[in-house]
């Protein structure tokens, strides 16, 4: 039940994740114009990886998306680059956990394939999440080092004919809904990992002796039944009982790790 | 690169009007927000006016609101400016400048730049 709810929860906060890395990656506020001792303005400017947005007092906004590729700074390539990586691999990763699902029965998935699918699924959503905070932690800096940049500027500016002076830009909503929306796809990809443990088959050997009935060649177990742990391969239960019917290979029996005595 | 060229500039009277243009060489003139930034003689650079890449937003110096109105013609890859009820003070060196992120009154924004057309009023 543990290891249901874990899986559960952990696809859930990494599709709530995931969601928020797409959404940060399509936003335009990913750096905004800093109004700190800016000089009084009508417009306000604010960027994102796609394109850079003019906004009137009216509320007016005008958007013009980036149309050169070569033109654009490596480093913006670069976040563009780890946010799309960060959405493919939590896509994938969401498609394999819904297989994964203990909670959903598709055929006669056993649940050793479904504790690897849940592993595989964990790890692409930990990937995902640290592709989505190094974008948008490369961002971030690229801010900060331009704003201080910036601010040099303003008070060591050439002075006299030249002024250096330029707008500062600081940090937009879409960083920090990705920081939030790549901790939580990670926190998503580990509770996959941890639920993967509890869904792996135990290996526990069992020792089985086959009876003989003297009379006649029937190999007999007590309950009809083949036992099962709920792990291996015997999830359809075959009666072992067949009423003497057997092929050659049959007439010695093998303990099995899921027979009892 | 985009390659702008000023002109329209001249002597006018007090109170007169001067309309200037600038041309940009540039196919992707679109792309560009405009600018209009001024130096008078002894003076540092002074921001006049901006608009957005399809003239949707327009931004003013308040020295100069009421008085200049900022145009763009993207199929002529154009930026104007028309100067009304001129002032003495208004006499400088007009630039014409571009950027293509952001409409700023700070001129150090502005990346690309003309090289510039003298106004002059008289008296």
């Known amino acids: 039940m543990a290891v249901t709810a874990c899986q559960g929860l952990g696809f859930v906060v990494s599709l709530i994740g995931i969601a928020g890395i797409i959404a940060a990656t399509c936003m335009d506020q990913w750096s905004t114009q800093d109004l700190y001792n800016n000089p009084v303005t009508a417009v306000f400017n604010y960027q994102g990886l796609w394109r850079s947005c003019v906004r009137e007092s009216s509320g007016f906004t005008e958007c013009r998306g980036y149309f050169t590729l070569l033109g654009l700074p490596a480093m913006l390539q670069a976040v563009r680059a780890l946010m799309i990586v960060g959405i493919v691999l939590g896509a994938i990763g969401l498609l394999v956990s819904i297989f994964a699902l203990k909670c959903i029965r598709i055929g006669s998935m056993e649940d050793s394939a479904k504790a690897n699918m849940t592993l595989t699924s964990g790890i692409m959503f930990i990937v995902s999440g640290l592709c989505a905070i190094a974008g948008v932690s490369v961002f971030a800096n690229m801010l900060v080092t331009n704003f201080w940049m910036s601010t040099a500027n303003m008070y060591t500016g050439m002075g006299g004919m030249v002024q250096t002076v330029q707008t500062r830009y600081t940090f937009g909503a879409a960083l920090f809904v990705g920081w939030v929306a790549g901790g939580l796809t990670l926190i998503g990809g580990v509770m996959m990992c941890i639920a993967c443990r509890g869904l792996a088959p135990e290996e526990t050997n069992y020792k089985a002796v086959s009876y003989h009935a003297s009379g006649h060649s029937v190999a007999y177990k007590p309950g009809g039944f083949k036992a099962s742990t709920g792990f291996g391969s015997n999830t359809k239960n075959k009666k072992i009982y067949d009423g003497g019917a057997r092929t050659e290979d049959e007439v010695q029996s093998y303990p099995s790790k899921h027979d009892y005595v | 690169q985009v390659q702008l060229v000023e002109s329209g500039g001249g002597l006018v009277q007090t109170g007169g009007s001067l309309r200037l243009s600038c041309a940009a060489s540039d196919s992707t003139f679109s792309s560009y927000i405009m600018g209009w930034v001024r130096q008078a003689p002894g003076k540092g650079l002074e921001w006049v006016a901006g608009?957005?890449?399809?003239?949707?937003?327009?931004d003013y110096a308040d020295s100069v609101k009421g008085r200049f109105t900022i145009a763009r013609d993207n199929a002529k890859n154009t930026v104007y400016l028309q100067m009304n009820s001129l002032k003495p003070e208004d006499a400088a060196i007009y630039y014409c400048?571009?950027?293509?992120?952001?409409?700023?009154?700070?001129?150090?924004?502005?990346?690309?730049w003309g090289q510039g057309t003298q106004v002059t009023v008289s008296s």
């Open positions: 400048a571009a950027n293509a992120i952001q409409l700023t009154r700070r001129s150090g924004d502005y990346a690309y």
């Open positions: 608009i957005t890449w399809s003239g949707g937003i327009k």
